[in-house]
């Protein structure tokens, strides 16, 4: 008789999840010499230990501490790029501008990017059928708590000028409920961070509006200012040209506004 299994509203664990995490870890540590000391089997064991046999609505940041410890990584604190609702462009940018880092350019972010996972209370099984949805089921689920934990640590590590890429095509360019708005903004350290610089990415070809004047950007500025951190904002009118100019800064067309 098959055992009754909790049905959650979200998609289940990504297929071949253990193999994917392990393979990503091996690949990352091969590419990044400073992480070659990392034992990927231990990383997987710590990752697994954070959610296996635990109720998937009762996960805490504490559960992820062994994994955080193993994945400790130093990135240049003044080269951090945060993003909200525009992951692909942010990643394309750091692939070209190799000295800047998104969270997904770190080991832990790379391991979990685009994956879903959860377990079940009192069994060592991984649930491939369904996992809790943040809104419909619970916020303290394995995936949400993981991203909240690594995002907090990433923001806490930042210094000097921190950049954030925001999606100018969305109704809320700055969304207080996003990971950036609810976690990263609040964990920038005023004693280390001098300025948060927002890059608002335009979607339309003919969009010449100054999206830095958007009410949600003004609210972000106000929130950041209350933290005693300076704020600046730039419109990126042509993201395609922006990337091109990062690749080829000496191009004559790259002196004009992008």
């Amino acid at each position: 008789v098959p055992r009754w299994r909790q049905q959650w509203s979200g998609p289940g664990t990504t297929k071949r999840f253990p193999e994917t995490v392990l393979a990503r870890c091996v690949k990352y540590t091969e590419i990044h010499p400073e992480m070659r000391h990392v034992d990927c089997q231990s990383v997987w064991d710590a990752f697994k230990g954070a959610f296996i046999s635990k109720h998937p609505c009762n996960i805490t940041e504490e559960d992820y501490q062994p994994l955080m410890k193993l994945g400790t990584q130093t990135v240049p604190c003044n080269k951090i790029l945060l993003w909200s609702r525009i992951k692909d462009l942010a990643h394309q940018f750091t692939q070209v501008q190799r000295d800047m880092f998104t969270l997904e350019d770190t080991l832990l972010g790379y391991l979990a990017d685009d994956l879903t996972w959860c377990g079940e209370f009192n069994t060592s099984k991984i649930n491939y059928q369904s996992c809790p949805d943040w809104r419909k089921d619970c916020s303290n689920n394995p995936v949400s708590v993981f991203w909240k934990t690594v995002s907090r640590r990433f923001a806490e590590a930042a210094c000097d000028v921190v950049h954030v890429m925001l999606n100018g095509s969305r109704s809320k360019i700055f969304d207080k409920n996003s990971t950036f708005g609810s976690v990263e903004v609040h964990n920038l350290q005023p004693e280390k961070v001098q300025t948060l610089e927002a890059w608002v990415i335009h979607g339309g070809r003919e969009d010449s509006r100054d999206l830095c004047q958007d009410p949600t950007i003004k609210e972000l500025e106000s929130i950041i200012s209350k933290r005693n951190i300076q704020f600046s904002c730039k419109n990126i009118y042509r993201p395609d040209k922006f990337l091109q100019c990062v690749k080829n800064p000496e191009d004559s067309s790259c002196t004009s506004e992008i």
Epitope: E219, S222, S225, K226, N228, Q230, S232
Partner: antibody
Framework: VKESEGGLFKPTDTLTLTCTVS????????VIWVRQAPGKGLEYIGF???????YYANWAKSRSTITRNTNENTVTLKMTSLTAADTATYFC???????????WGPGTLVTVSS | AYDMTQTPASVSEPVGGTVTIKCQAS??????LSWYQQKLGQPPKLLIY???TLASGVSSRFKGSGSGTEYTLTISGVECADAATYYC????????????FGGGTEVVVK
């Protein structure tokens, strides 16, 4: 943190108060203006941020201006079209850790009367 | 707008008792809340910031708690010196607000 002398003003006058800070830099901490009418609660007026951007309470927007001089370590509040309802003790406050108001000036009494 | 509602307006408690003051924000202020004590003729004094962190030199009898929109200040083992007016303040944003402070709570010690 210390506010300049207040005093007696007439209705329609313009109030100018200066706050002088020492022991910290205006490029590291913002400064808030708060007032308190006699026997009443605290009322936020506005705030100048580390980058120089200013913010105001909705009620104060139309007739208040906050400016700063980082060289002289001063922040100035200017409020136009005074009425008797503006009679209050005005405080200058440092915007401190986590945005809290951690260092308060002694306050200066402003009386508006004809 | 981030409007703050503070209750009660006044409370009377005997020496050694416990006083609880509540503050509600009209929307989430992400634990950016501070508490102040003001005695007659003096400027307010910061007691607690970030909802629960005790300011330097403040007695541990003062305890702050809460998150989201609901916050509480608890004064345990009330002393005569605690007689004052207490205010909460949201520290999340300085724009689009009517007032960042709650209306105040007068604490009378019997």
């Amino acid at each position: 943190v210390k506010e300049s002398e207040g005093g007696l003003f007439k209705p329609t006058d313009t109030l100018t108060l200066t706050c002088t800070v020492s022991g910290f830099s205006l490029s590291s901490y913002g400064v808030i203006w708060v007032r308190q009418a006699p026997g009443k609660g605290l009322e936020y007026i506005g705030f100048v941020a580390v980058g120089g951007t200013t913010y105001y309470a909705n009620w104060a927007k139309s007739r208040s201006t906050i400016t700063r001089n980082t060289n002289e370590n001063t922040v100035t509040l200017k409020m136009t079209s005074l009425t008797a309802a503006d009679t209050a003790t005005y405080f200058c406050v440092r915007n401190g850790v986590s945005g809290s108001s951690d260092i308060w000036g002694p306050g200066t009494l402003v009386t508006v009367s004809s | 707008a981030y409007d703050m509602t503070q209750t009660p307006a006044s409370v009377s408690e005997p020496v050694g008792g416990t006083v609880t003051i509540k503050c509600q924000a009209s929307q989430s202020i992400y634990s950016y809340l501070s508490w102040y004590q003001q005695k007659l003729g003096q400027p307010p004094k910061l007691l607690i910031y970030s909802a629960s962190t005790l300011a330097s030199g403040v007695s541990s009898r003062f305890k702050g708690s809460g998150s989201g929109t609901e916050y509480t200040l608890t004064i345990s083992g009330v002393e005569c010196a605690d007689a004052a007016t207490y205010y909460c303040q949201q520290d999340y944003s300085g724009s689009n607000v009517d007032n960042t402070f709650g209306g105040g709570t007068e604490v009378v010690v019997k």
